[in-house]
């Protein structure tokens, strides 16, 4: 039959060439002379000339060595024609399979592989995967089947076999316990890939395994005991810097310290923060310390990390003895602001109050007093006793110095410390009203017609407070009642002035006496301009001229 079985040819054959592979033969050669030819890639098309055929015998020839990794299979067509060129057979398919030789070494995809694993993990933990390729056949032969192995490990601490590699997949895993970043932060493995499933050619590469930090080291105080001196009353004062060491990776959450005052700060006087660069604990005062109340504080500070510990670790504690230093403190008025009620207009030399200060210091310091601010100059203060007395007339109605009945004075106390310190107090004198002002009418100038005059309503004001004000009483004096009447309204806060007899046009004085509810009398002269007119007027009309 005009057929040929697939032909297997090993790659890299050493010849001699041309090498006879198989004979094409048509059974039509009994009837006529047959000429054989081949076509297809490898024969008459690229790569041309790899195969040929002996025209008359039909021997298929290989002209040069084959390379399976370049072309693994050739598909040619065999042709049989008679002397006159007529085809005597259908074209025949010729398959030439190039069989593999182990002519390639494995190649790692990288010269150096990098991976990482957390310190302290259990054996079996995967680290990374390495890959090598081999161009040879791995399906029908072992030529391209790669087996991985670890050739060496550096350093060899704590064991020479900290890692293993899956022979088929190239996955590197931890096999031994004891990975400790603080002792060995990085391992370099020389890895091998060997073809023939481990029995052939070998190539090497490097796998670098970085050991990642776990928070398996506690920060430790160094030193553990501190003594500090702090002036009393200082707020935000740096008391002490506490230093810790931590073997974990610097500037990581496993290294960064967190400080906590565990004891000794009953009054919540202290606070502690972490310095972002040095990792030190900065102990500062949150409130002022009081030497007189407690001159020594013993604090206990515990340190942990931002990250939780991966295992139970003993925490480090520091002891800080804080000595409070005495400071000459300013005297403090008690109370800081004192309210005293006093009658206005009390006689000069009359005592107002005693206003004294206390010195927080335990020494018996002498305190002297003086007035710091007395806007009206109404008061004096005894430097030794703090006795405040009136030296001027306290006037409740003085709008320049008194606001809402209160006269404000600032006083000063000074101790005899070295250097001396001062404290201030505020004395608020609430001035009690005295009936020292009579009622006053407004306005005090009026204009009125002498014919059918309009009644003039005057408002009554009194600077005093109730009950020294309305109801008011009015009385005309000095014969003013001959021409005028004065009547207070029902509410008692206005007076109505009326012209009861004709007066010629001129200016007159009306003598009006007003008294308040406390019978304080005030005489006021009203200037009345009388005009020749009827009813209501604001200014007198000019003289009338006839025409």
């Amino acid at each position: 039959d005009w057929v040929v079985a697939p032909i297997s040819v090993p790659e890299n054959g050493k010849g001699p060439f041309p090498q006879r592979l198989n004979q094409l033969k048509s059974n039509k050669d009994r009837d006529t002379k047959i000429f054989y030819s081949i076509t297809g890639p490898g024969a008459d098309s690229p790569p041309e000339g790899v195969f040929a055929v002996e025209k008359e015998t039909g021997w298929l020839l290989l002209n040069k060595p084959l390379d399976r990794e370049e072309i693994a299979k050739y598909e040619l067509f065999g042709h049989a024609v008679s002397e006159n060129g007529a085809s005597v057979e259908d074209p025949m398919n010729i398959s030439i399979i190039v069989t593999d030789q182990n002519d390639h070494k494995p190649k790692f995809t990288q010269d150096t592989f990098r991976g990482s694993v957390l310190e302290g993990v259990l054996p079996g933990t995967s680290v990374m995967q390495v890959t090598a390729t081999d161009e040879d056949d791995a399906i029908y032969t072992y030529n391209g089947v790669v087996a991985y192995s670890i050739h060496s490990q550096e350093p060899k601490d704590p064991h020479d076999l900290m890692f293993t590699i899956h022979r088929s997949t190239g996955t590197i895993s931890v096999i031994s316990s004891g990975l400790d970043r603080e002792k060995v932060p990085e391992y370099t493995l020389t890895i091998q890939a060997t073809d023939m499933d481990g029995d052939g050619s070998t190539t090497t590469a490097v796998a670098v395994v970085e050991i990642l930090d776990a928070n398996d080291n506690a920060p430790m105080f160094d030193p553990q005991k501190y003594e500090a001196h702090v002036p009393e009353n200082a707020v935000g004062h740096e008391v002490q810097r506490l230093t810790v060491t931590d073997l974990d990776a610097p500037n990581s959450p496993a290294w960064r310290a967190t400080y906590l005052i565990m004891g000794g700060d009953d009054g919540d006087h202290f606070t502690i923060t972490t310095h972002p660069e040095s990792n030190q604990g900065i102990l500062t005062t949150r409130k002022g310390l009081d030497f007189e109340a407690k001159n020594q504080h013993t604090l206990y500070v515990e340190v942990t990390n931002e990250a939780p510990f991966v295992l139970k670790l003993p925490t480090s504690t520091a002891t800080i003895v804080v000595h409070v230093e005495d400071v000459n403190e300013a005297p403090v008025f008690v109370p800081p602001s004192k309210v005293v009620e006093v009658q206005e207009g009390i006689p000069t030399g009359e005592p107002v109050c005693v206003y004294t200060a206390e010195d927080p210091d335990k020494e018996n310091q002498k305190i002297s007093y003086r007035i710091l601010r007395d806007p009206a100059g109404w008061l004096a203060m005894d430097p030794d006793s703090g006795q405040v007395t009136a030296v001027g007339t306290l006037d409740r109605e003085d709008e320049q110095f008194v606001r809402n009945n209160i006269y404000e004075v600032m006083v000063l106390a000074m101790d005899n410390g070295s250097p001396p310190t001062t404290g201030t107090g505020t004395l608020l004198l609430t001035l009690i009203d005295v009936n020292d002002h009579g009622p006053v009418p407004e306005p005090r100038q009026i204009t009125i017609c002498n014919q059918s005059p309009v009644r003039q309503v005057l408002n009554i004001t009194d600077k005093d407070l109730s009950p020294h004000t309305s109801p008011f009483q009015a009385q005309l004096t000095d014969d003013s009642d001959i021409y005028w009447t004065a009547e207070v309204n029902e509410e008692g806060d206005t007076v109505v002035l009326s012209l009861k007899k004709f007066l010629k046009q001129d200016t007159y004085d009306v003598h009006l006496s007003l008294s308040d509810h406390g019978n304080k009398e005030q005489l006021t002269v009203i200037r009345a301009t009388v005009c020749d007119c009827h009813g209501h007027v604001e200014t007198c009309p000019g003289p009338w001229k006839g025409g």
């Epitope: 302290g120 259990l122 079996g124 064991h159 899956h166 996955t171 316990s177 004891g178 295992l311």
Partner: antibody, heavy 117, light 111 residues
Framework: EVQLLESGGGLVQPGGSLRLSCAAS????????MSWVRQAPGKGLEWVSA????????YYADSVKGRFTISRDNSKNTLYLQMNSLRAEDTAVYYC??????????WGQGTMVTVSS | QSALTQPASVSGSPGQSITISCTGT?????????VSWYQQHPGKAPKLILS???KRPSGVSNRFSGSKSGNTASLSISGLQAEDEADYYC???????????FGGGTKLTVL
């Protein structure tokens, strides 16, 4: 020479608790992963739990997960197994074992745990 | 159901040789050369007799030998002696949380 001595076994009712201890000596305890392996009467070896040298990583067999807790105190060279909600099928000899550098185990003599009402 | 498969029992007469097989997968026995064999006498703790397929710890008789082919490891005991009667367990390293797998054990009887 590695020496491991288990203690804490005994008879306990179902649902009860026991705490096994394993005192280690003869090696740098904190550098080695440790395991508990059990063997039910007449049966084979069964991996129960493991803990890394630092104590930061642990492993449990599905059959004990959520009931048993492995821990270690490196300052005392001691391994522990806290066993809660015990069942009849937890009856076994419990061995403490250290994981050697060449994927081998060094074994203690074992302690018997019997769960029965 | 153990991860590694061993015959339940084998037997042999004194002086004879026997072989115990331990079959795993390409992810344990087949992947790593970390197969160990343990001997356990009744009432005793297991004792390591072979590590890394074929390495004997000091003090273990050279009558014990090991080998591996593909996914199967084997323990061979030559010149059987009465004291060899015991249970034998194979174990293999594997990647993952269950980093050590055990075989179901093989009871060796010396006839």
């Amino acid at each position: 020479e590695v020496q491991l001595l288990e203690s804490g076994g005994g008879l306990v009712q179902p649902g009860g608790s026991l705490r096994l201890s394993c005192a280690a000596s003869g090696f740098t305890f904190s550098s080695y992963a440790m395991s508990w392996v059990r063997q039910a009467p007449g049966k084979g070896l069964e991996w129960v739990s493991a803990i890394s040298g630092s104590g930061g990583s642990t492993y449990y067999a599905d059959s004990v997960k959520g009931r048993f807790t492995i821990s270690r105190d490196n300052s005392k060279n001691t391994l522990y197994l806290q066993m809660n909600s015990l069942r009849a099928e937890d009856t076994a000899v419990y061995y403490c074992a250290s994981w050697g550098p060449r994927a081998t185990l060094d074994w203690g003599q074992g302690t018997m745990v019997t769960v029965s009402s | 159901q153990s991860a590694l498969t061993q015959p339940a029992s084998v037997s042999g007469s004194p002086g004879q040789s026997i072989t115990i097989s331990c079959t795993g997968t390409s992810n344990d026995v087949g992947a790593y050369n970390y197969v160990s064999w343990y001997q356990q006498h009744p009432g005793k703790a297991p004792k390591l007799i072979l590590s890394e397929v074929n390495k004997r710890p000091s003090g273990v008789s050279n009558r014990f030998s090991g080998s591996k082919s593909g996914n199967t490891a084997s323990l061979s005991i030559s010149g059987l002696q009465a004291e060899d009667e015991a249970d034998y367990y194979c174990s293999s390293f594997t990647s993952g949380s269950t980093f050590m797998l055990f075989g179901g054990g093989t009871k060796l009887t010396v006839l």
